[in-house]
Interface confidence: medium
């Protein structure tokens, strides 16, 4: 007779949906990589549930995740970064559900930072610049960035610009005069690695000059 047969909690657990999703961050802390997983159903009772990754690891067969509130997390140098790993939700030694995942296809870059906008009066444009930690990385170096901006009063009217560099020029005539704008940027892997959009950078706010009535241009 199975030892699990008398465990009512486990029998109930097997009826639950243990779907989960994960993302990896490479060289997120020096040469350390991270892997973060979470259940798709926020109401899953995570008591006694553990995550384990096996395969495509360096020097070890498997690694256990640490639990941080409702997310499960590993920080390690031991990801092989080629081939698929098996990630399982476990209760004790019993696997409830598993997924084969190539960690290079679920990369979530770090958010860009130091976003700023400088108005060039002579050129009648705004130069948007930002920084990314990925310029210094060995692995996820090539990113596509999504710059989004909106007039502050237009809550959901974001204009998006995709670019591979960390510099963008916005023409003054494309923006409303004497208006407050919010701008932010995020990144996604673009080349060998695949995955998800990073978190948005902190927003930057800038005001466009007023129109100079005599010339029809902004001040």
């Amino acid at each position: 007779e199975s030892g699990y047969a008398q465990n009512g909690d486990l029998e109930d657990a097997e009826l639950d949906d243990y779907s989960f999703s994960c993302y990896s961050q490479l060289e997120v802390n020096g040469s350390q990589h991270s892997l973060t997983c979470a259940f798709e159903d926020p109401d899953v009772n995570t008591t006694n549930l553990e995550f384990e990754i096996c395969g495509a690891l360096v020097e070890v067969k498997c690694l256990n995740f640490r639990k941080l509130q409702e997310i499960y997390f590993i920080e390690t140098k031991k990801f092989l970064l080629i081939g698929k790993s098996n990630i399982c939700v476990k209760v004790g030694e019993k696997s409830l559900t598993c997924k084969k995942i190539d960690l290079t296809t679920i990369v979530k870059p770090e958010a860009p930072f130091d976003l700023s906008v400088i108005y060039r009066e002579g050129a009648n444009d705004f130069v948007v610049t930002f920084n990314t930690s990925h310029l210094q990385k060995k692995y996820v170096k090539v990113l596509m960035h999504d710059v989004a901006y909106r007039q502050e009063k237009d809550e959901n009217k974001w204009t998006h610009v995709n670019l591979s560099s960390t510099k963008l020029t916005l023409l003054q005539r494309k923006l409303q005069p004497a208006a407050m704008y919010e701008i932010k940027v995020r990144s996604i892997p673009d080349h060998y690695f695949k995955g998800f959009w990073s978190e948005w950078s902190p927003s930057y706010y800038f005001r466009t000059p007023e129109i100079n009535n005599s010339s029809g241009e902004m001040d």
Epitope: V58, L80, I82, G83, T104, K138, K194
Partner: antibody, heavy 121, light 109 residues
């Protein structure tokens, strides 16, 4: 039974092309990176090329870079090596090999019996 | 690229002998090393991975040790079927490449 069967070898003149094939069976082909390794007569093993499960990771030995192309068709459980601008020094027995990264390191745990390529005028 | 140098290139030994083959990497590779055995006319066979883990079905007289730059393959008591050529192998995952040592030929004395 896990099996790799190479084909496509033969006698070819220098400068010509040849395409090797490797038919895989007995395992989930698209879970594994695959490699070509060659062995010239009386010589040691030389890694030629490798390709990740999804074809996004590809590598070549310096001796074949720019001349050989590795590719795979996961739907057909097949691995290929397109060899162009062949030279006499490419003469060798060419093995197809499966990786087994789940062991913790990239190791070649299953090998075919090889197909012979002879480059000679 | 990392170079692997095996020594000796060849050696003669008798049945029952203890034999050690070494593999030196040109730079540290942690324990990213495998050993293969190849008999004439046959494909190579995996013996050891992770520098010291024995492949399933391989006799326990084979063992591997080492990390960093220096690795050894030891056969504790040679059997007639062990006379073959042995190769060490290392890999890199990004960019993808594999390197083999030049081989060590083990012959009957």
């Amino acid at each position: 039974e896990v099996q790799l069967v190479e084909s496509g070898g033969g006698l070819v003149q220098p400068g010509r092309s040849l395409r090797l094939s490797c038919a895989a069976s007995g395992f989930t082909f698209d879970d594994h990176a695959m490699h070509w390794v060659r062995q010239a007569p009386g010589k040691g093993l030389e890694w030629v090329s490798g390709i990740s499960w999804n074809s996004r990771g590809i590598g070549y030995a310096d001796s074949v870079k720019g001349r050989f192309t590795i590719f795979r068709d996961n739907a057909k459980n097949s691995l290929y090596l397109q060899m162009n601008s062949l030279r006499a020094e490419d003469t060798a027995l060419y093995y197809c090999a499966k990786d087994e990264y789940s062991r913790g390191y990239y190791v070649l745990d299953v090998w075919g019996q090889g197909t012979t390529v002879t480059v000679s005028s | 690229a990392i170079q692997l140098t095996q020594s000796p290139s060849s050696l003669s030994a008798s049945v029952g002998d203890r034999v050690t083959i070494t593999c030196r990497a040109s730079q540290g590779i942690s324990s990213a090393l495998a050993w293969y055995q190849q008999k004439p006319g046959k494909a190579p066979k995996l013996l050891i991975y992770d520098a010291s883990s024995l492949e399933s079905g391989v006799p326990s007289r084979f063992s591997g040790s080492g990390s960093g730059t220096d690795f050894t393959l030891t056969i504790s008591s040679l059997q007639p079927e062990d006379f073959a050529t042995y190769y060490c192998q290392q890999f890199n995952s990004y960019p993808l490449w594999i390197a083999f040592g030049q081989g060590t030929r083990l012959e009957i004395k």
